[in-house]
């Protein structure tokens, strides 16, 4: 087994690592220098209380996934300048506030993973008056919530807490603190969630449930006393429901009175989209939601998924929608003219291919829509997806990026506010008169592309990266453009001349090609002061391909001979 | 030098009990999670239950749960499994094996295993 | 419960040769620490089993070099560069991301 003391390095700054070795102990002399000390993945059991006795400028300690299972009382005795403190994934099955006790400065604590059953007999974090950001829990025997657990807190930034297993949750506990920006709660059953929904419903503002089976959940009227919620988000991450249970859901998001956004990641619908409030149920009122984010979807009776017009009514004031990667084929056309308010439409990642696309851009479909999203889908046509969109009167950014496209024709018929058109990885080999006049920022990137001469008179930003250009478009044609990125081609040089006629131009990125470092090409970019400025990847990404023998180095590092600059 | 010795194994009626044990030596003892894993005559490795260092933290397969009881004596050393209500498919040599010390760091020494015969 | 599935389950091979054992499991072995924690061991007849590896790709001390890990997520591999006689015996993949512990049923080198 190697050494304590090898596996750790230290630099000037007082950072030290020693992560994903084999230390099974912190290692000896560590002294007032260390300021950061990483020390996550090795085989350390227990800490002592003179292991980090005289680091007394620490400031940040990472002990995740240890098999730390001993803290003695005074081990942090001397850290008042901690910060952070990382000691998830270990073997902890008792938490001593004797620990805590010093560390005045804490503002970020991780205990998840850890083996205990409640956070202790005293409350843990109540000298912590800076902290920000707690983790808490574990996924299989932390199993109570109790009152005292976070008194003294009084607001959070973060509060993360794995219940995976709660059992028991004393009423109040999460009420006694004021004020928490983002609360995440894994729980694996549901039982106890309206209880917590209760306590937390005034102090949280975002709201996140993970790993919750909700195949089951029942709404009931929740005796709240108040209804004044802070609650702006909610979001439901690998959590499980059903077509019933999506509706208690949603009238539990009623009591909520200011959401604005709405998320759910990685969920599963074991439903088949019947939404149908049963007659006894009052309608749900969507109330303020403005946006709606779904992603990664699974329903496993995807073949025999209703068409959602139950739920039309509630979609007239969203204004941002987000479906990604969720087998979306179709938005049929009444579902597009019912979302009265959208702005932004997000459907990356699915199968929508032009034929369907034209049912759902049907006349008056979305007609408030600024921006449409329809990257990796399975569109095929640039002429057709074109056409289709031309419905959207409003619509001034459409993203088509990662859609096979291969060709494109010589004309194309666009929505005539279009000011940002994103083609990148759509396999063009080059680009026509499809490509609208009226673009103020287009982005053909990772494609190719071997030349670009479109004149394009409003166009301020180009994004032509990875493709095959040999020299810089004509700027000419360009006449508005103020940013350019078109490194990783195969441009060789380039003259002071030439970057002199985009009269405009303030961002130049271009590192990443071949450069022929002739003389003339090393006097232009080393004697420009100013060209630093507007070259935002120099110097780094500005690498000499010939003459051979300076290959590999920085332009603004190579020195040709006098000899080799002076030749007739 | 780490050394694992398990012990009483031996021909059990089904139905009936046994308790085995697992003496440990060269390492700290309370500090590391322990485990039992058994092998059925001519088959593969399955685990059976674990026990954290301290805090008392148990954990059972399935097949064994109700039945068996993990535990340990941290002040001796030793490791034991207590096995009661005994069926045929139990037959097995019993492994004890030792955590590595570093989290969820399975298994860095095994000890030579003890037979446990389920037969009437 | 995590089913490990180990393919082949028996292969010959020769002294010298690159043996390449797979082991797939039902689940994503990705801890939410962000390890994955999937170890491979040998065991030889009448032997207890001995761990070569640890966390996909980490060689326990004393195991020979032609021994090592790769893979992620569901999809692993334990590959021996160059057979010795010494190496033949049977080989298991362990899971440890999840409750219960699974072992794959195991892999058995023989001699061609």
């Known amino acids: 087994e190697s050494s304590n003391q090898a596996s750790l390095s230290c630099d000037r700054n007082g950072i030290c690592k020693g992560s994903s070795g084999s230390l099974n102990s912190i290692p000896s002399g560590l002294t007032e220098a260390v300021k950061s000390l990483d020390l996550s993945n090795n085989r350390i059991t227990y800490i002592s209380n003179s292991d980090l006795q005289r680091c007394v400028n620490l400031q940040a300690l990472v002990l995740t996934s240890n098999g730390i299972n001993t803290i003695e009382e005074d081990s942090f005795s001397s850290l008042g300048s901690l910060e952070h403190l990382d000691l998830s994934y270990n073997y902890l099955s008792n938490l001593s506030s004797s620990w805590f006790k010093p560390l005045s400065s804490l503002t970020f604590l991780n205990l998840l993973g850890n083996p205990y059953k409640t956070l202790g007999e005293t409350s843990l974090f109540s000298h912590l008056t800076k902290l920000q950001i707690l983790r808490v829990g574990n996924m299989d025997t932390f199993t109570k919530i109790q009152r005292k657990d976070f008194a003294g807190l009084t607001f959070l930034e973060e509060l993360e807490i794995d219940a995976s297993d709660l059992q028991s949750y004393e009423p109040k506990s999460l009420k006694s603190i004021q004020n928490v920006s983002h609360l995440i709660l894994h729980m694996k059953q549901h039982i106890l969630l309206l209880e917590i929904f209760v306590d937390v419903t005034s102090s949280v503002e975002c709201l996140e449930l993970r790993d919750t089976d909700l195949d089951t959940f029942h709404f009931s009227e929740l005796s709240t006393g108040e209804t004044n919620s802070l609650i702006k988000k909610f979001t439901f991450r690998n959590v499980k429901i059903t077509d019933e249970s999506l509706f208690q859901v949603m009238k539990l998001l009623n009591q909520i009175s200011g959401l604005l956004e709405l998320e759910f990641d990685d969920c599963t619908l074991n439903g088949v989209g019947n939404f149908r409030a049963s007659d006894n149920d009052r309608v749900i009122d969507p109330g303020k939601v403005e946006t709606l984010t779904i992603r990664r979807l699974h329903i496993p009776r995807f073949y025999l998924f209703y068409d959602l017009s139950t739920l039309y009514s509630l979609t007239e004031r969203v204004k941002r929608i987000t479906v990604e990667n969720s087998k979306v084929f179709l938005v049929p056309c009444l579902l597009s003219q019912h979302l009265k308010s959208l702005e932004y439409l997000d459907l990356s990642e699915n199968l929508m291919v032009e034929e369907y696309l034209k049912n759902s851009a049907c006349e008056d479909a979305w007609p408030s829509l600024q921006t449409l999203i329809l990257r990796q889908n399975h569109l095929a046509s640039l002429e057709k997806t074109g056409e289709t969109l031309l419905t959207l009167k409003n619509l001034t950014n459409i993203d088509i990026s990662k859609n096979s496209f291969h060709s494109m024709p010589e004309t194309c018929q666009w929505p005539e506010k279009m000011k940002y058109l994103n083609l990148s990885s759509t396999r063009i080999h080059s680009v026509t008169g499809c490509i609208p006049k009226t673009l103020e920022i287009l982005d053909v990137s990772n494609n190719n592309l071997n030349l670009f001469s479109l004149n394009l008179p409003q166009l301020k930003e180009l994004y032509i990266s990875r493709n095959k250009l040999m020299t810089l478009p004509d700027a000419s044609l360009l006449p508005m453009l103020l940013v350019l990125k078109i490194s990783r081609n195969a441009i060789t040089t380039f003259s002071k001349e030439q970057l002199d006629s985009f009269h405009t131009l303030k961002t130049l990125e271009a590192g990443g090609n071949n450069f022929i470092c002739s003389c003339e090409f090393l006097s232009f970019t080393q004697e420009q002061q100013a060209l630093a400025k507007v070259l935002i990847d120099w110097p780094a990404n500005y690498l000499c391909d010939s003459p051979s023998h300076v290959r590999g180095q920085q332009v603004q590092d190579v020195r040709l001979s006098v000899s080799e600059c002076h030749r007739t | 030098e780490v050394q694992l010795v398990e012990s009483g194994g031996g021909l059990v009626q089904p139905g009936g009990s046994l308790r085995l044990s697992c003496a440990a030596s060269g390492f700290t003892f309370s500090n590391y999670a322990m485990s039992w894993v058994r092998q059925a005559p001519g088959k593969g490795l399955e685990w059976v239950a674990a026990?954290?260092?301290?805090?008392?933290?148990?954990n059972y397969a399935d097949s064994v749960k109700g039945r068996f009881t993990i535990s340990r004596d941290n002040s001796k050393n030793t490791l034991y499994l207590q096995m009661n209500s005994l069926r045929a498919e139990d037959t097995a040599v019993y492994y004890c094996?030792?955590?590595?010390?570093?989290?969820?760091?399975?298994?860095?020494?095994w000890g030579q295993g003890t037979l446990v015969t389920v037969s009437s | 419960d995590v089913q490990m599935t180990q393919s082949p389950s028996s292969l010959s091979a020769s002294v010298g040769d690159r043996v390449t054992i797979t082991c797939r499991s039902s689940q994503s072995l990705v801890f939410s620490d962000g390890n994955t924690y999937l170890n491979w061991f040998q065991q030889k007849p009448g032997k207890a089993p001995k761990r070569l590896i640890y966390?996909?790709?980490n060689r326990d001390s004393g195991v020979p070099s032609r021994f090592s890990g790769s893979g992620s997520g569901t999809d692993f591999t334990l590959t021996i560069s160059s057979l010795q006689p010494e190496d033949f015996a049977t080989y298991y993949c362990?899971?440890?991301?999840?409750?219960?512990?699974?072992f794959g049923q195991g892999t058995k080198v023989e001699i061609k």
């Open positions: 966390k996909v790709s």
């Open positions: 362990m899971q440890g991301a999840h409750w219960p512990l699974t």
């Open positions: 094996a030792k955590e590595g010390g570093g989290y969820r760091d399975y298994f860095d020494y």
């Open positions: 026990i954290y260092g301290r805090g008392g933290y148990t």
